[in-house]
């Protein structure tokens, strides 16, 4: 693979990662695939500092991140360990709420208007953030 040393045009560099912020919405799976086609992944939040950075750029808008529990346990799309990692859920969340009437529960995580996280129906068309790491040889993203 080829190593990327600077971020592509229209991406924002921060702490050796590149971020791209959508301005329109897609379902979580479409957003996930979109990032993969950019040789990136949905954003994985590993620290309070990164949380603040992303929150600053997205504003008070529901925005998908690379965290889901569609196969059971919560998983980050890049393999980062969920249990030991950074979390910023809203109080009482995640709740896998079934009361929305859309069928099933809530399996995909997003930033809410105050930046804290909520689980929601994966089909909702929210904005999303792609992330790719600098100084890392390009490789196939991990399978879900």
């Amino acid at each position: 693979g080829s190593e990327r040393t600077c971020c592509p045009v229209n991406w924002v560099e921060h702490e050796r990662s590149c971020y791209w912020f959508s301005r329109s919405g897609k379902a979580w799976a479409d957003a996930d695939n979109y990032c993969r086609l950019e040789d990136a992944h949905l954003v994985v939040v590993t620290s309070w500092e990164e949380q603040k950075f992303v929150q600053h750029h997205i504003g008070p808008v529901n925005t998908w991140m690379g965290l889901h529990d569609q196969n059971g346990p919560w998983k980050w799309v890049d393999g980062t360990d969920y249990e030991t990692g950074f979390k910023n859920w809203r109080p009482e969340q995640p709740d896998d709420w079934y009361g929305h009437g859309l069928g099933g529960g809530e399996d995909c995580a997003h930033f809410t208007d105050d930046g804290r996280w909520n689980d929601d129906v994966c089909q909702r068309p929210y904005r999303w953030v792609c992330e790719t790491e600098l100084d890392k040889a390009s490789q196939e993203p991990p399978l879900l």
Partner: antibody
Framework: EVQLLESGGGLVQPGGSLRLSCAAS????????MTWVRQAPGKGPEWVSV????????FYADSVKGRFTISRDNSKNTLYLQMSSLRAEDTAVYFC????????????????WGQGTMVTVSS | GVQMTQSPSSLSASVGDRVTITCRAS??????LNWYQQKPGKAPKLLIY???SLQSGVPSRFSGGGSGTDFTLTISSLQPEDFATYYC???????????FGQGTKLEIK
């Protein structure tokens, strides 16, 4: 000049294989996802497959999954489509196209197309 | 995935006419809608992207509109070179499987 040029089409028997190539010029090939689209005679375009700029991510239409393989050689600015277990319904003109996304273009669209190469599957 | 339906499938018109082609999505696709023109023996050519934005080099007589599920392509005054087949495409789904409409063939009356 931005250009895509397909080659490799021809007549093949059912069950046979064929490899299509698409030579790109005039843009930074490795920066763009690339796609294959086919068009059966008298029909509309049908998306077939897409590959990310590095080649690390690939996607396929259900109709070709497990039979077709998309790949690219960025050192040669070339896109490929390996087709196997070909069927009569795969008969079509095959186009390669640049898939420009809104990360680098003002749109998500297939903005540059080749002239197409004809694949005929018949005994 | 989202299914796209175009109407009419064919249309006869004269030079100078104003024509409108419609495209309907099976669910909301926001503004993820492109229009292509294709002439016999040629590849499709991008005309309109993001529902209403004109691709560079495309004449201003072409315009697009709509959002959500219903979209239109309008040609304000048909020119001889506009007789072709027009396709809509959604890029809401990634990858864009079943993304093209079935086409509208614009013929000379």
């Amino acid at each position: 000049e931005v250009q895509l040029l397909e080659s490799g089409g021809g007549l093949v028997q059912p069950g046979g294989s064929l490899r299509l190539s698409c030579a790109a010029s005039g843009f930074t090939f490795s920066s763009y996802a690339m796609t294959w689209v086919r068009q059966a005679p008298g029909k509309g375009p049908e998306w077939v497959s897409v590959i990310s700029g590095s080649g690390g991510s690939t996607f396929y239409a259900d109709s070709v999954k497990g039979r077709f393989t998309i790949s690219r050689d960025n050192s040669k600015n070339t896109l490929y489509l390996q087709m196997s277990s070909l069927r009569a319904e795969d008969t079509a003109v095959y186009f390669c196209a640049r898939y420009c996304s809104s990360t680098r273009c003002p749109y998500d669209a297939f903005d540059i197309w080749g002239q197409g190469t004809m694949v005929t599957v018949s005994s | 995935g989202v299914q796209m339906t175009q109407s009419p499938s064919s249309l006869s018109a004269s030079v100078g006419d104003r024509v409108t082609i419609t495209c309907r999505a099976s669910q909301s696709i926001s503004g993820y809608l492109n229009w292509y023109q294709q002439k016999p023996g040629k590849a499709p050519k991008l005309l309109i992207y993001a529902a209403s934005s004109l691709q560079s080099g495309v004449p201003s007589r072409f315009s697009g509109g709509g959002s959500g599920t219903d979209f239109t392509l309008t040609i304000s005054s048909l020119q001889p070179e506009d007789f072709a087949t027009y396709y809509c495409q959604q890029t809401y789904n990634t990858p864009p499987e079943r993304s093209f409409g079935q086409g509208t063939k614009l013929e000379i009356k």
